[in-house]
């Protein structure tokens, strides 16, 4: 008579998280008398995850009725699947004995892996605006995904970039892991309006990737552009000297009027005209009395930009 | 007769996280009379998945009807699969035995390897904004993806990047697997508007990737080129200087007019022009009381922006 | 619904002999071990042994090893436990369970002379 | 046989204090086979943990098991009125199966 065997016909079983995981478990004899127990993992550390006759394992239900009449087949089902089920198991046949059963044959085990949805990846750009032509950093973070296969791409505007670092964490076997990744991405003035994507593709987003954005306005300071001209004006004793500031991001502006490097005024930029890359423009204007000096006068526009350090322009105003 | 053999026909299954696996046992004969187990792993540490006859494995359910006379098969399902799961399965047979039963025979196991969608993937930029032409770092990372096996890409703009670095963690094996990838991006000028954008594909993907996008805007500086210009002027005694500001970004920015190196009038920045690449223009003008000034005057336009050293631009203004 | 029903409470004269039944529904005790606990007045829990109702195959602490007799009767999906040789200090309510999760009611068994 | 020592024998302690229960094992125990189980005046045990850390359905979340080897703990985070009971713990690793004497959780 053959001896008992204990057949696992899969080797592995992949399942989603949430989803219930059969393992599959068959028998080819009735003999010897004894319970069937399912295991995760092997030796004295094994974890019983059903046990036929006692016990309280409510995720698990057998896929066949195992007490009716010469049943062979031991299949489980287990709910609700985790990151944490994963592991390789076991179906053994004890043989009934004094005082305890004895443990007779197992199966060769059936690792199951779950896979696991990537969290939303979350982009976050630098704590510091930097200036184009800089390269600023941005990160990429997705959590609790299975198995470790995971793929990540990073875009600026739809184009994809090459300058960044990835890291898949733990390194070692994990029930779910997270990935981390690095971009630099090196700014022109054009960026206002700009956005990087990170797009994380999973086994278990079936093609349809995750991605998360970042703005690269909340990275980008476009220092602004100054031109001080001279209006006409009617009035014979009177100057008007203007001050055009051009294209800055983010909004943030204070312009200080400067006669002869003298403060005359001080304008926080209030009404902005949008430029339709993202960058502003102002004018602020000083109203000089021309008979109030004898000689010729520098009047200097000078702006401090979201809190960098000044820059300024000069114009020399003629007194004839 | 013929020994009892446990077939396990699949080496292998793989299932989507929160889906079932059916994990495939089927026994060559009823003799020996006995219970099967499904185990998790081989070995002491091995752990048990399904009981025949006592225990509560609730995502366990068999097939076919275990009892029904003659069974051989004896396949499970495991529901809400999710990466912990992921292990070799093994459909073990015991003999009943005094005083316990003893194992009998074990398929040969069946490997469940879980696929996990990767997690959105999460794009963060430099915490410091760059200016053009220089190089800044996004990261990209996305979790809990499963298998291993994953692509990244980068993108600026719909330009694929070719500077970067990816991981994918951990380097052994695991339920779930982390991405973490740094991409190196050289800003220009006119990255105001651009985007990265990280692109992951994964197996469970089905061919559509998931996308995660930062905005170079946020993490460009552009600095403004400053032109101090005189304007006509109708009265004689007046002149009007203006510096305009352009191509900054970002927005804030703060002017300073200097009269022959004297603060004559700081403005912030309000209302800015937009340029079509993002930037922002801005002018201020200084209007200069030629009266008030003997000799020639040096106006300057000293621009500070983002919080950057101020850059400036003088103009002679000629007293005649 | 699980549900295990105890017999009545008993009386018995010490070197008595009593025997309790646990009749179970929602399930066949086939599909189970049933198991026996004794409580004592005021005491914590004793395991007394179980039964295979499949097979009929009995498991027995040492402490009751020879008096206890568990049987099974699957045609009525009933279990049953028979004290014998009965002493004061067997007087406890004794729990029939169902593979250590579901429990019958308790019967109260009083020794005394 | 495994003997199962549970300590303390009486905990007095007030709603919204965290109890301990300890059970430690003559000889190791395979964390799959320790269950706990919950026991009012006058009706039958009703299991309260499975399999060292798993709280049975209905179970309040402020219950945790936990432990591995010889020594095992039940934790009640924030004690409420209902909480107070007879604890035991309970091994079914091998025959014979054998039950803690009990902790009796009291209102101080």
């Known amino acids: 008579e053959d001896e008992l065997q204990v057949i696992q016909p899969e080797k592995s079983v992949s399942v989603a998280a949430g989803e219930s995981a059969t393992l599959r478990c068959a028998m080819t004899s009735l003999i010897p008398v004894g319970p069937i127990m399912w295991f995760r993992g092997a030796g004295a550390g094994r974890e019983l995850i059903y046990n036929q006759k006692e016990g309280h394992f409510p995720r698990v239900t057998t896929v066949s009725e195992l007490t009716k009449r010469n049943n062979l087949d031991f299949s489980i089902s287990i709910s609700n699947i985790t990151p944490a089920d994963a592991g390789t198991y076991y179906c053994v046949k004890f043989r009934k004995g004094s005082p305890d059963d004895v443990e007779f044959k197992s199966g060769a085990g059936t690792e199951l892996s779950v896979r696991a949805k990537p969290s939303a990846p979350v982009v976050s750009g630098p704590a510091v605006r930097a200036t184009p032509e800089h390269t600023v950093s941005f990160t990429c973070e997705s959590h609790g995904f299975s198995p470790r296969d995971i793929t990540l791409k990073w875009f600026k505007n739809g184009n994809e970039l090459s300058d960044f670092q990835t890291n898949v964490d733990p390194a070692g076997d994990s029930v779910s892991y997270s990935i981390h990744s690095t971009a630099r991405v090196v700014l022109t003035r054009g960026d206002v309006h700009s956005q990087v994507i990170c797009e994380i593709a999973h086994i278990t987003l079936q093609g349809d990737p995750l991605r998360g954005t970042a703005n690269l306005s909340e990275a980008i300071r476009v220092p602004p552009t100054l031109e001080v001209t001279q209006q006409p004006m009617r009035a014979e004793n009177q100057a008007n000297v203007t001050c055009q500031v051009s294209n800055f991001y983010p909004r943030g502006l204070q312009l200080t009027w400067l006669e002869n490097g003298n403060v005359s005024r001080t304008e926080t930029a209030s009404t902005l005209i949008e430029n339709k890359d993202g960058t502003y423009n102002w004018m602020s204007w000083l109203l000089v009395n021309t008979c109030a000096h004898r000689d010729d006068v520098v009047l200097t526009c000078q702006v401090e930009h979201d809190g960098q350090q000044a820059v300024s322009k000069s114009y020399a105003l003629e007194i004839s | 007769e013929d020994e009892l053999q446990v077939i396990q026909p699949e080496k292998s299954v793989s299932v989507a996280a929160g889906e079932s696996a059916t994990l495939r046992c089927a026994m060559t004969s009823l003799i020996p009379v006995g219970p099967i187990m499904w185990f998790r792993g081989a070995g002491a540490g091995r752990e048990l998945i399904y009981n025949q006859k006592e225990g509560h494995f609730p995502r366990v359910t068999t097939v076919s009807e275990l009892t029904k006379r003659n069974n051989l098969d004896f396949s499970i399902s495991i529901s809400n699969i999710t990466p912990a799961d992921a292990g070799t399965y093994y459909c073990v047979k015991f003999r009943k035995g005094s005083p316990d039963d003893v194992e009998f025979k074990s398929g040969a196991g069946t490997e469940l390897s879980v696929r996990a969608k990767p997690s959105a993937p999460v794009v963060s930029g430099p915490a410091v904004r760059a200016t053009p032409e220089h190089t800044v770092s996004f990261t990209c990372e996305s979790h809990g993806f499963s298998p291993r096996d994953i692509t990244l890409k980068w993108f600026k703009n719909g330009n694929e990047l070719s500077d970067f670095q990816t991981n994918v963690d951990p380097a052994g094996d695991s339920v779930s697997y982390s991405i973490h990838s740094t991409a190196r991006v050289v800003l220009t000028r006119g990255d105001v508007h651009s985007q990265v954008i990280c692109e992951i594909a994964h197996i469970t993907l089905q061919g559509d990737p998931l996308r995660g996008t930062a905005n170079l805007s946020e993490a460009i500086r552009v600095p403004p080129t400053l032109e101090v210009t005189q304007q006509p002027m109708r009265a004689e005694n007046q002149a009007n200087v203006t510096c305009q500001v352009s191509n900054f970004y970002p927005r804030g920015l703060q002017l300073t007019w200097l009269e022959n190196g004297n603060v004559s009038r700081t403005e912030t920045a309000s209302t800015l022009i937009e340029n079509k690449d993002g930037t922002y223009n801005w002018m201020s003008w200084l209007l200069v009381n030629t009266c008030a000034h003997r000799d020639d005057v040096v106006l300057t336009c000293q621009v500070e922006h983002d919080g950057q050293q101020a850059v400036s631009k003088s103009y002679a203004l000629e007293i005649s | 619904e699980v549900q295990l029903v105890q017999s009545g409470a008993e009386v018995k004269k010490p070197g008595a002999t009593v025997k309790i039944s646990c009749k179970a529904s929602?399930?066949?005790?086939?599909?189970?071990?049933m198991h026996w606990v004794q409580q004592a007045p005021g005491k914590g829990l004793e395991w007394i042994g179980r039964i295979d109702p499949e097979d009929a195959e009995t498991k027995y602490a040492p402490k009751f090893q020879g008096r206890v007799t568990i049987t099974a009767d699957t045609s009525t999906n009933t279990a049953y436990m028979e004290l014998s040789s009965l002493r004061s200090e067997d007087t406890a309510v004794y729990y029939c369970d169902r593979g250590l999760a579901y429990w019958g009611q308790g019967t109260l068994v009083t020794v005394s002379s | 046989e495994i003997v199962l020592t549970q300590s303390p024998a009486t905990l007095s302690l007030s709603p919204g204090e965290r109890a301990t229960l300890s059970c430690s094992a003559s000889s190791s125990v395979s964390s799959s086979y320790l269950y706990w189980y919950q026991q009012k005046p006058g009706q039958a045990p009703k299991l309260w943990i499975y399999?060292?850390?798993n709280l049975a359905s209905g179970i309040p979340a402020r219950f945790s098991g936990s432990g591995s080897g010889t020594d095992y703990t039940l934790t009640i985070s924030s004690l409420e009125p209902e909480d107070f009971a007879v604890y035991y713990c309970h091994q079914w690793s091998s025959y014979p199966y054998t039950f803690g004497q009990g902790t009796k959780l009291e209102i101080k």
């Open positions: 399999s060292t850390s």
């Open positions: 929602g399930f066949n005790i086939k599909d189970y071990y």
